[in-house]
């Protein structure tokens, strides 16, 4: 095909799993160059105004080459950088962090239940989010319904654009995502030693354009390559478009179709007017919502990464487009983080560590509002346990942008699944508010007093009431209302159509109307304004809390040195499911009042904790609490009972070091640790280190 070509062949050395920097770079250099040259081609095609189909093919090839480069970069990284997923998942399932939903009925893929530990962790991640964003920025939090009437999602573009192609096993009805299945099938064919160079080249070309194929092209490819169900070997149905939203009907009549929301954002846009009023009509302001969203993934296969019901936390920051400047940007300007700009991606470069202030100054990040949120997102993610070295912000390339966005940066984390998107930070421009305003005829705008009155050129539709009334009778009112709220950009576009073709079409409330020259013309005049109407731009940070949580699992999972069986999660104290454990060294009755007293005091201090008075050795009990990420451990030992003042030991999970302090002090120490007011190093500086028992009893708390 015209603008696609198989990615260049890998040097032999590329099969090695990890190597030194120079060796790795030697392997990556040709792949970087291949991306770069494809980037040049895309640019040239655009310059030459080549047909869109050719640009799309070239872009698909660019993305394919990018994927090859990225996969190789990941493969060349040191093996100890990658978590033992099987071991981690065993711990997560065994300790009931989460499990497949409806497990006793055989489970449903893409649906999960969180157990006590997972639930506590998730709540803490959400609570930290509230403090970090809602409280810090004085954001207006709302809670909207999940059920959404169809017209809302029609207007937002989700009904038309939120779809994938799907194929079905003709015998058992099992569904597969067409692109995923075709990709896996072609990769299998290509790995066959008997596959000729020409055939391989042809298949690579198909893979490169996978994102661009329409329904019929996909159907032909399934036939050409004889794709069958990978599970049963049965024939597959032709691909059909499958909308990823869960459809339902609101009310018993079945005449009000709706969907479970695919994102929480729409609820905020629809309440914009009320929120603006609540904010005394002033921009900028932000609104947020935390709640579940739903996507009917065709065949979810990646654990918590791809699910059908998931918790999102979304902020919509409404800003005057002429004032995209954040007063608090300086607070984050000195952060250094990995940025992977669109330019770097098409040049085959890696993400590069940059000071945020420099990134905005150099135009890598468009404005300080976007820059501020990127900085705050970074601080939040690292606060909850994501490793800064496995976190990058990747800018969407022009062709990847969602239908509503004009610039977008994703926070991506490096996991055993590769780089996964965990937060999207999109500049949605004025897409949503404009769409909903046009559909509902409710102007979703803010008013801004002008320093000086100004004379402006006005462009309006001037409809002929008579002609429209004659043509559309009782629907004429609909047409007139629609025409009254069209913006200048839209009017100018329609005027061009009117001049070129003598007519244009509008769509409102599900009805289509054709307007001809005798029904409408365009009026231009001047008027003096004292206030200015502003359609706010929207910066939207959107957090996938399940993916964040999964990343935290991977980035904090460790195996104790020298003991493969002892695993633990080093959750930061602020999100740890339990802040501390209370462990009596013995089941002796005289220990119990101290356990009770300490537990009650911890509760009074708001410190979630777990009492483990089971009979196992103290070392085994530490291991058990470490395994679920309990941040600290208080041990009531014989010295607690036998000596005054009554003291106990406090153990840090990560270093396994201990100090000794009075029982009465421990709740506030743990509370301060959990809130991040002090660090373990501060605690060690203030209290004596504890290295063994003083009473000579047989059972010690040394590990």
């Amino acid at each position: 095909s015209a603008a696609s070509c198989p990615p260049i062949s890998l040097p032999a050395a590329a099969s090695r799993s990890s190597m030194d920097g120079a060796g790795a770079e030697e392997v990556l250099a040709p792949l970087r160059l291949a991306v770069r040259q494809q980037g040049d081609l895309v640019r040239k095609l655009k310059e030459d105004k080549a047909p869109q189909v050719d640009v799309d093919k070239a872009v698909a090839e660019l993305k394919a080459r990018k994927r090859v480069l990225e996969a190789k970069e990941l493969a060349l990284q040191p093996k100890d950088d990658i978590v033992d997923r099987a071991k981690m998942e065993d711990t997560l399932k065994r300790r009931f962090f989460y499990d497949q939903a409806f497990a006793i009925y055989g489970g449903v893929s893409g649906l999960y239940d969180f157990g006590p530990v997972g639930c506590a962790l998730k709540n803490n991640i959400i609570q930290t989010w509230r403090q970090h964003f809602i409280q810090e920025e004085q954001i207006l939090e709302i809670d909207c319904t999940m059920l959404t009437p169809e017209p809302v999602l029609k207007t937002s573009g989700h009904v038309d654009k939120f779809a994938d192609f799907m194929v079905k096993d003709v015998k058992n009805g099992e569904c597969f995502r067409a692109d995923h299945l075709l990709k896996a099938h072609l990769q299998k064919l290509m790995s066959d030693k008997k596959c000729s160079v020409e055939k391989k080249s042809e298949m690579e070309s198909v893979l490169a354009q996978l994102d661009n194929y329409g329904q019929q092209e996909l159907a032909d490819l399934f036939v050409n390559y004889n794709v069958k169900s990978p599970i049963t070997g049965n024939d597959l149905s032709p691909p059909v478009s499958f909308n990823l939203m869960f459809k339902t009907f609101i009310g018993p009549g079945g005449n009000m179709p709706g969907y479970l929301r695919p994102e929480t954002a729409q609820g905020i846009f629809l309440n914009f007017k009320r929120l603006l009023e609540f904010n005394q009509g002033k921009l900028p302001f932000a609104a947020a919502q935390i709640g579940n969203s739903f996507r009917n993934e065709i065949s979810p296969r990646s654990g918590l990464i791809r699910v059908r019901e998931f918790t999102m936390a979304e902020i919509e920051h409404f800003v005057d487009p002429s004032e995209k400047d954040h007063p608090k940007f300086q607070n984050v300007a000195d952060l250094h983080l990995y940025l992977y700009s669109a330019k770097a991606q098409v040049s085959g470069q890696s993400a590069r560590k940059m000071r945020l202030g420099d990134a905005v100054e150099q135009g890598v990040i468009n404005n300080t509002v976007l820059g501020y949120f990127i900085g705050r997102i970074y601080l939040y993610l690292t606060k909850v346990g994501i490793s800064p070295d496995k976190l990058r912000f990747r800018q969407h390339m022009e062709n990847e942008m969602a239908h509503y966005a004009c610039d977008c940066w994703d926070a991506e984390s490096k996991t055993s699944y590769g780089w996964i998107e965990i937060v999207g930070c999109a500049d949605r421009s004025c897409y949503d508010l404009s769409c909903h305003a046009r559909a509902t005829k409710v102007p979703l705008v803010a008013e801004k007093p002008l320093k000086e009155p100004k004379t402006v050129n006005v462009v309006q539709f001037e409809p002929s009431k008579g002609a429209i009334g004659k043509a559309y009778k009782k629907d004429a009112k609909l047409v007139m209302e629609y025409l009254a709220i069209c913006d200048e950009c839209y009017i100018t576009e329609m005027e061009m159509l009117l001049n070129e073709k003598g007519e244009f079409t509008i769509e409102t409330e599900g009805k289509t109307f054709q307007l001809t020259k005798d029904m409408i013309n365009v009026k231009r005049f001047q008027k003096t304004l004292y206030v200015e109407e502003v359609v706010p731009n929207v910066i939207e940070p959107s957090f996938g809390l399940g993916r964040i949580m999964y990343t935290v699992f991977e980035h904090t999972f460790h195996v104790r040195e020298g003991d493969e069986q002892r695993t633990f999660f080093s959750f930061p104290a602020v999100v740890a499911p339990f802040k501390c454990s209370v462990l009596p060294l013995s089941q002796n009755q005289e220990f119990m009042p101290f356990v009770k007293e300490l537990s009650e005091a911890l509760t009074r201090h708001g410190v979630s904790h777990k009492v483990d008075d089971s009979s196992g050795s103290i070392g085994r009990r530490y291991a058990r609490t470490d395994e679920i990420g309990v941040a600290f451990g208080v041990t009531i030992d014989f010295d607690t009972v036998n000596k005054t003042p009554h003291t106990a030991t406090l153990r840090d999970r990560d270093s396994m070091r201990q100090i000794r302090a009075e029982i009465s002090e421990l709740p506030s120490i743990v509370q301060d640790l959990a809130n991040g007011n002090i660090t373990w190093a501060d605690v060690e500086a203030r209290y004596p280190l504890f290295e063994g028992q003083e009473t000579g009893k047989k059972e010690t708390i040394e590990e």
Partner: antibody, heavy 116, light 110 residues
Framework: EVQLLESGGGLVQPGGSLRLSCAAS????????MSWVRQAPGKGLEWVSA????????YYADSVKGRFTISRDNSKNTLYLQMNSLRAEDTAVYYC?????????WGQGTLVTVSS | QSVLTQPPSASGTPGQRVTISCSGS????????VTWYQQLPGTAPKLLIY???HRPSGVPDRFSGSKSGTSASLAISGLRSEDEADYYC???????????FGGGTKLTVL
């Protein structure tokens, strides 16, 4: 309008050195990879060298490796080719061209003659 | 000795269609795009076809390119006297880590 203008050619003795320059205008020079291509009198085109937009990587033909050095100064919109240990077979018109595998704009060339 | 092989010469009468072939290997044409350049007498080369079959703006649609496997060809239909020039094919070569040209084909319009 995109323009590439080579300079610095001339007569040089075998073993000598020469530095060619290519002044670019009409496009964002710092956003493009650049190359040098040469053509011996009455012969075909031969690729010489290429450099990334940020100077991060350079490539050379085997025939010039170790003797020629490609570089650029984005603040001056200029591409350079430092040629050392010149040989008679390096005699050619040297062109600078935009990109590394899709030479969409070429300069008019500068003649380098290596002769004693 | 060029890495890509082109016939040294080709000819045709005005209005005729001529094709110029270019053959290489899996490390160049087989795995990368082919580009064609036109060099009119006494001038610098000019981009004629890129990405196997794309014409830059300003190049007449009489010129077309194609590629199959490890070979490529340039077709010129409706030959005109001003098409008399040297034509070069080129492609990036992955195993040489460099760009390679064909030896050039001198087209004569009779």
């Amino acid at each position: 309008e995109v323009q590439l203008l080579e300079s610095g050619g001339g007569l040089v003795q075998p073993g000598g050195s020469l530095r060619l320059s290519c002044a670019a205008s009409g496009f964002t020079f710092s956003g493009y990879d650049m190359s040098w291509v040469r053509q011996a009198p009455g012969k075909g085109l031969e690729w010489v060298s290429a450099i990334y937009s940020d100077s991060g990587s350079t490539y050379y033909a085997d025939s010039v490796k170790g003797r020629f050095t490609i570089s650029r100064d984005n603040s001056k919109n200029t591409l350079y080719l430092q040629m050392n240990s010149l040989r008679a077979e390096d005699t050619a018109v040297y062109y600078c061209a935009r990109n590394t595998a899709l030479f969409d704009y070429w300069g008019q060339g500068t003649l380098v003659t290596v002769s004693s | 000795q060029s890495v890509l092989t082109q016939p040294p010469s080709a000819s045709g009468t005005p209005g005729q269609r001529v094709t110029i072939s270019c053959s290489g290997s899996s490390s160049n044409i087989g795995s990368n795009y082919v580009t064609w350049y036109q060099q009119l007498p006494g001038t610098a080369p000019k981009l004629l076809i890129y990405a196997n079959n794309h014409r830059p703006s300003g190049v007449p649609d009489r010129f077309s390119g194609s590629k199959s496997g490890t070979s490529a060809s340039l077709a010129i239909s409706g030959l005109r006297s001003e098409d008399e020039a040297d034509y070069y094919c080129g492609a990036w070569d992955a195993s040489l880590s460099g760009y390679v040209f064909g030896g050039g084909t001198k087209l004569t319009v009779l």
